[in-house]
């Protein structure tokens, strides 16, 4: 029988930059039954809090609520590790919540294949960005990126549309169901989840363009 | 305890490629950016881009755009910063830095001096 | 890019003795989301340059408290207190508001 090991805070992740929540992995538990506690004080304070809502985030981690977040202040954070046996203590951990936001995926995401007389064909798409996300504040830029296969296809075809929330691609394989998603993620930020698949048949008689190329 | 170990000294002619290695232990890998920092003799430090290791997204200084590649090995935790079309003037310490969830480097590596000589 | 100008380019100072260091950008570090991404690192001779200040004011973790930074906008400066012989080493300071990220050129502070 042992003290725990060293837990580590490996993630911390906001949907909207309103509120957060990190988790820790359990070091060693010496055998013993193990409590974690995690501690924080923002910059610029030497008080110590301990963790508001142990329960929200699941198993090992800690949820900042709306009033426990700040987009303004550096939070500083270790987590304790106690048994009969003795304590260990994680790596302080700095977190800034503009560098941790990973959003919901974006929404409505519309597929349609245009055929102009005048011009080769394409398949055109449109999205919303996710509905948490403030975009109107400034500091927060989103960027997407696309990906679409033929249905029976293992291999994704990935297209970056920068902070577009429209997209062109011109070179598509005729008679084909092809899957569509989309994705975003602040510029600092992590990528959220694909959007669900939206589904389109490619006509028979769409012309493939000699060149593989995208346009905004 | 956390460490970015560097790879060795390198000497290179002009016009030719450096790859630069900083393995990460005593973290999870994925967890934080790796940025790229150099310092020719004497000079300051200049910043040259970022990765994230969980999905290998990049930033770069337009200065090195082109000419840099940052990339990240998970399964040896390990990212690589690779110079292209040497000249005598990227002759310099290369260092690679950590992150937490901020964009200020907490920790750093103890430099690879790369020189560029004909 | 941002230009991060430093004085002085250098400084001999007495053990004991206070020390102060400016750094002045070259547009405000004031990110839109309302923080200001301003740093000070020291470079010891012969190692990597270790985080002092982060964020204009907060001292790192093991930062001795005779450390301090202040300034907003786009004038900053450090003060060491009281100088130690462990203090000697050229000091940068660093913004992170604006991509690329940017530092100054360096204040060598040596002992008299």
């Known amino acids: 029988q042992l003290p725990p090991g060293k837990p580590e805070i490996f993630k911390c992740r906001s949907p909207n930059k309103e509120t957060f929540t990190c988790w820790w992995r359990p070091g060693t538990d010496g055998g013993l039954p193990t409590n974690y506690s995690l501690t924080y004080h923002r910059e610029g304070e030497t008080l110590m809090h301990e963790c508001p809502d142990y329960i929200t985030g699941g198993p090992n981690s800690c949820h900042f609520g709306k009033q426990y977040t700040s987009m303004w202040r550096t939070y500083v954070m270790m987590v304790n590790a106690t048994n009969q046996m003795g304590s260990s203590f994680s790596d302080e951990l700095y977190v800034d919540v503009t560098y941790i936001v990973q959003p919901d995926p974006p929404l409505e995401l519309t597929v349609e294949v245009k055929q102009p007389e005048d011009r080769k064909p394409y398949l055109w798409m449109k999205w919303s960005p996710p509905t948490l996300i403030d975009l109107k504040t400034g500091w927060f830029t989103l960027l997407y990126e696309i990906r679409l296969k033929p249905e029976k296809a293992a291999e994704w075809e990935t297209h970056f549309a920068g902070q577009q929330t429209e997209f062109k691609i011109l070179s598509l394989h005729p008679g084909q169901k092809y899957l569509v998603q989309v994705r975003c993620k602040p510029d600092h930020g992590y990528w959220s989840a694909w959007s669900p698949a939206t589904f389109i048949q490619i006509p028979s008689d769409f012309i493939m363009n000699d060149h593989h190329h995208h346009h905004h | 305890e956390v460490q970015l170990v560097q790879s060795g000294a390198e000497v290179k002619k002009p016009g030719s490629s450096v790859k630069v290695s900083c393995k990460a232990s005593?973290?999870?890998?994925?967890?934080?950016?790796i940025h790229w920092v150099r310092q020719a003799p004497g000079q300051g430090l200049e910043w040259m881009g970022e990765?994230?290791?969980?999905?290998?997204?990049?930033n770069y200084n337009q200065k090195f755009k082109g000419r840099v590649t940052i990339t990240a090995d998970k399964s040896t935790s390990t990212a690589y910063m690779e110079l292209s079309s040497l000249r005598s003037e990227d002759t310099a310490v290369y260092y690679c830095?950590?992150?937490?969830?901020?964009?200020?480097?907490?920790?750093w590596g103890q430099g690879t001096l790369v020189t560029v000589s004909s | 890019d941002v230009v991060m100008t430093q004085t002085p380019l250098s400084l001999s100072v007495t053990p004991g003795q206070p020390a102060s260091i400016s750094c002045r950008s070259s547009?405000?570090?004031?990110?839109?989301?309302?923080?200001?991404?301003l740093h000070w690192y020291l470079q010891k001779p012969g190692q990597s340059p270790q985080l002092l200040i982060y964020?204009?004011?907060n001292r790192f973790s093991g930062v001795p408290d005779r450390f301090s930074g202040s300034g907003s906008g786009t004038d900053f400066t450090l003060k060491i207190s009281r100088v130690e012989a462990e203090d000697v080493g050229v000091y940068f300071c660093?913004?992170?508001?604006?991509?690329?990220?940017?530092f100054g050129g360096g204040t060598k502070v040596e002992i008299k």
């Open positions: 830095a950590r992150s937490f969830f901020t964009n200020w480097f907490a920790y």
């Open positions: 005593g973290y999870t890998f994925t967890s934080y950016w």
């Open positions: 990765i994230d290791p969980s999905d290998s997204y990049t």
């Open positions: 547009q405000s570090l004031v990110h839109s989301n309302g923080n200001t991404y």
């Open positions: 964020k204009v004011s």
């Open positions: 660093s913004q992170s508001t604006h991509v690329p990220f940017t």
